[in-house]
Structure formats: C-alpha cells, structure tokens
C-alpha cells in the first residue's frame, strides 16, 4: 500500500475514470456468499479490465472476479467477514485503482417476495404481509423493511412505513375509498451488518371498497 499518495487531495483523484461500487450478498446460494462490482461510469471500456479481491479471505490470499457483461461477480464461501478486503481494478496484472472495503458494510439483502394485501371487512383494515429469504439465513437475519404504497393515479406520492416485522396493518380510514393502490416493499440490513436497500419486491395492486355507511353512522 506504500504506493498510495498520502495527500488527501490526491488520493481520491486516483484514476477517477475507473471508480466502481460493490455490494455483497451473504448466503445468497446456500452457504455461498457473493460480491458484485461495477464501474460507476457505464461508458468505461471494460475490455481487458479485471477485478480482484485480496485480504480477509479464508485459505486463499486473493480471488478473481468473473465478468458477466458489464458487471464483475464472485460467488464463494471464502469471505472471512471480518477485516477489510482490498478490491482492485487491474489491467495486465497492474492495479489501476483499489478500495479497502469491509464486506459486512456493503450488504444488499435479497428483495422481499410474496407481497399480498387482504381486506378485513369487520376490522375495516388491510393486512399487508410479505416474505423474505433472510428469515432462514444465519448472518443477515435482522432487516428493516420499507413498505411503500400509493394511489395508482398519484404518480409520485408514495407513502412509506418502516417496520422490522413482515406484517403491517393499514387502516381503511387512512386510504381513499374506491381507489386502486399499488404497494411494494424493500429491505436493508439492521443489526451489525450495514449496506444498501434491496431491490423492490414486485408490486401488488389492490382496490379499496366504497364507504358503506350503516344507518345513523357518520362519515369519518
């Protein structure tokens, strides 16, 4: 590492053309973890460019990434998950730019799935449930979920609810009657592990019923 410039202004100028970002996914395939990296500039000519990770690995010093179109990818059990790894972009064996990264701080959970909404007539509410593969995992088990919903006609007016469980109740009185709603959910690590929001789950669409006033009942 002695080749690094020590001047704070210089160090981040280190071949900006090749700046990249990565995310890790733990136990993404059984006990295998994955690491995905990509250049931030989509126009980078990636011909002959390779990625390599060294340090904080089990039994090996370094691992090379596989290239899949414009992304670089590793699937392995060999992440130590403690300490920082050095991830480098290389050409012809020479490093162009490197980043020291702790893989536990760049975790991107898998997207939630099986999102559904059930209307309870007696309770006048909607029970939102979804599933996550992380309930079965041994590392990234604790997540914060972001449930977003909107009236379909309101293009950008998303309402958000954060929760740690996989069940949410929406009160009918807080929704517009006789309206079509879109709802989706994503997740982020929430205990020890840090990182990024997952992809959104597929959206679920549901319609609210009309207001059905009983005799003598007032509109809310």
């Amino acid at each position: 590492e002695s080749g690094y410039a020590q001047n704070g202004d210089l160090e981040d100028a280190e071949l900006d053309d090749y700046s990249f970002s990565c995310y890790s996914q733990l136990e993404v395939n059984g006990s295998q973890h994955s690491l995905t990296c990509a250049f931030e500039d989509p126009d980078v000519n990636t011909t002959n460019l390779e990625f390599e990770i060294c340090g904080a690995l089990v039994e090996v010093k370094c691992l090379s990434f596989r290239k899949l179109q414009e992304i670089y990818f590793i699937e392995t059990k060999k992440f130590l998950l403690i300490g920082k790894s050095n991830i480098c972009v290389k050409v012809g064996g020479k490093s162009l730019t490197c980043k020291k990264i702790d893989l536990t701080t760049i975790v991107k959970p898998e997207a939630p799935f099986d999102l559904s909404v059930i209307y309870r007539e007696g309770a006048n509410d909607f029970v939102v449930t979804f599933n996550t593969s992380h309930l079965q995992k041994k590392y990234v088990k604790v997540l914060m979920h972001d449930v977003a919903y909107r009236q379909e006609k309101d293009e950008n007016k998303w309402m958000h609810v954060n929760l740690s469980s996989t069940k949410l109740t929406l009160l009918q009185r807080n929704l517009q009657p006789e309206a079509m709603y879109e709802i989706k959910v994503r997740s982020i690590p929430d205990h020890y592990f840090k990182g990024f929001w997952s992809e959104w789950s597929p959206s679920y669409y549901f319609r609210t019923p009309e207001i059905n006033n009983s005799p003598g009942e007032m509109d809310p």
């Epitope: 590492e1 410039a5 160090e11 981040d12 920082k84 020890y192």
Partner: antibody, heavy 118, light 111 residues
Framework: QVQLVQSGAEVKKPGASVKVSCKAS????????LHWVKQAPGQGLEWIGG????????AYNQKFKGRVTMTSDRSTSTVYMELSSLRSEDTAVYYC???????????WGQGTTVTVSS | DIVLTQSPASLAVSPGQRATITCRTS??????????MHWYQQKPGQPPKLLIY???NLESGVPARFSGSGSETDFTLTINPVEAEDTANYYC?????????FGGGTKVEIK
C-alpha cells in the same frame, strides 16, 4: 511502515478543554477508521469513539457524548479528539487506534497523557 | 452495554507451560460463525497490541504460540508455550455492539 504519532502530554485545569492529535502515515488515510481509547492510571481500556476520515462520520460512546468531538484533516492525514469540561476523572492516557475491521484495533499510537488538576 | 468479565485477574506461569485466560460476555457477541471478540497484549508503558481478531484469527506478526477460541459468550486466549517476554496485561474486547467494551484485564507473570 504504518504509524500513528500522537501529540505530547497535556496538563489542564478542571473545566478546560484539551485537543489531542494523531497523525497517520504509511497507509492511505481514508481507508481506515480511527478511534480513541482511554486508559486511566492503573485501569483498563475504554472506547471513547471513532471517526471515518473518508466521510467525517463519527460514532461516540454515549458516556462521552456532548463532551467529545472528533475531527479529521485529510490534507495532513491527522485526526483530532477534543474533550471539554474536563474533570479529574479524565486524567488518563488517551490512545488513537486504527480500526483494521469492525471494530478491532490493529495499529495504536504511543498514547497522550492528559492530567487534569487544579 | 455488554459487560466482559475476564478470569483469572492474574496468573503466574512457568516458562514452557500453558496459560489460559477466559473472557465471558453478558450477551452473545457471535453472529453465526462471525465471532466479534478480540484479544490484546499490553506491556508496561506501551500501547496495547492486537494478538487475535474474530476470536481465532492470529494477527500478522504475532507468534503462533498465541491462539484464541470460543463463541457466543465464552472465549479463551491460550499462550502455549509461555515465554518470559509474555509478561503483560491481556484484554478481551467485543465489537458487536456500540459501545465497544473491553474486559478488565488479566495480568500474566512468568515464574
């Protein structure tokens, strides 16, 4: 080689503030978080907090919150810890330490003795 | 805060013998196989020195006579065989939860 060099000993009066520096060399400054650890005379070790020189983000032990401020200067690869409203219990050796991972300390400064006395 | 209790507080060992220090935590510091427990050696007038990270990983440059083991709430640092230069205080430290806390220390003396 990787080194953390701290500023010299300080003697302060109760109620005053002290600012201790820690200059890093031998590695890329923004690659590792730097933390501060207190060791009172004849006592064990106590984590005060840490700073990420890349972002300036800090994490403080609740016990020191409100009295401690950590800053970094990327142009000189130096981090600072300022401790205010000093009292006699703050008399200690203060170490800066590099975090090799979350959050263990693989490189330590030589320590700075701070004496608080009226 | 997670409390780390080290035992014994002190021990005297003959050169060539085994020294064992234990560290018990008030709650688990493990996430599956990730054990967030670390060990340091501190000699008088010197800063602490990292020996073991992640419960069992030997820090670069540390002699192989130092080893660590354990999981969840019970961890052990072993020095085998002990040498005269190992006279020092030894501390455990957890990093699963802020504030990152240390044990009270174990003083190892060589007979």
């Amino acid at each position: 080689q990787v080194q953390l060099v701290q500023s010299g000993a300080e003697v302060k009066k109760p109620g005053a503030s002290v600012k201790v520096s820690c200059k890093a060399s031998g590695y890329r400054f923004t690659d590792y978080e730097l933390h501060w650890v207190k060791q009172a005379p004849g006592q064990g070790l106590e984590w005060i907090g840490g700073i990420d020189p890349k972002t300036g983000g800090t994490a403080y032990n609740q016990k020191f919150k409100g009295r401690v401020t950590m800053t970094s200067d990327r142009s000189t690869s130096t981090v600072y810890m300022e401790l205010s409203s000093l009292r006699s219990e703050d008399t200690a050796v203060y170490y800066c330490a590099r975090s090799g991972g979350r959050w263990y300390f693989d490189v330590w400064g030589q320590g700075t003795t701070v004496t608080v006395s009226s | 805060d997670i409390v780390l209790t080290q035992s014994p507080a002190s021990l005297a060992v003959s050169p060539g013998q085994r020294a064992t220090i234990t560290c018990r935590t008030s709650e688990s510091v493990s996430i599956h196989l990730l054990h967030l427990m670390h060990w340091y050696q501190q000699k008088p007038g010197q800063p602490p020195k990292l020996l073991i990270y992640g419960a069992s990983n030997l820090e670069s440059g540390v002699p192989a006579r130092f080893s660590g083991s354990g999981s969840e709430t019970d961890f052990t640092l072993t020095i085998n065989p002990v040498e005269a230069e190992d006279t020092a205080n030894y501390y455990c430290q957890q990093s699963i939860k802020d504030p990152y806390t240390f044990g009270g220390g174990t003083k190892v003396e060589i007979k």
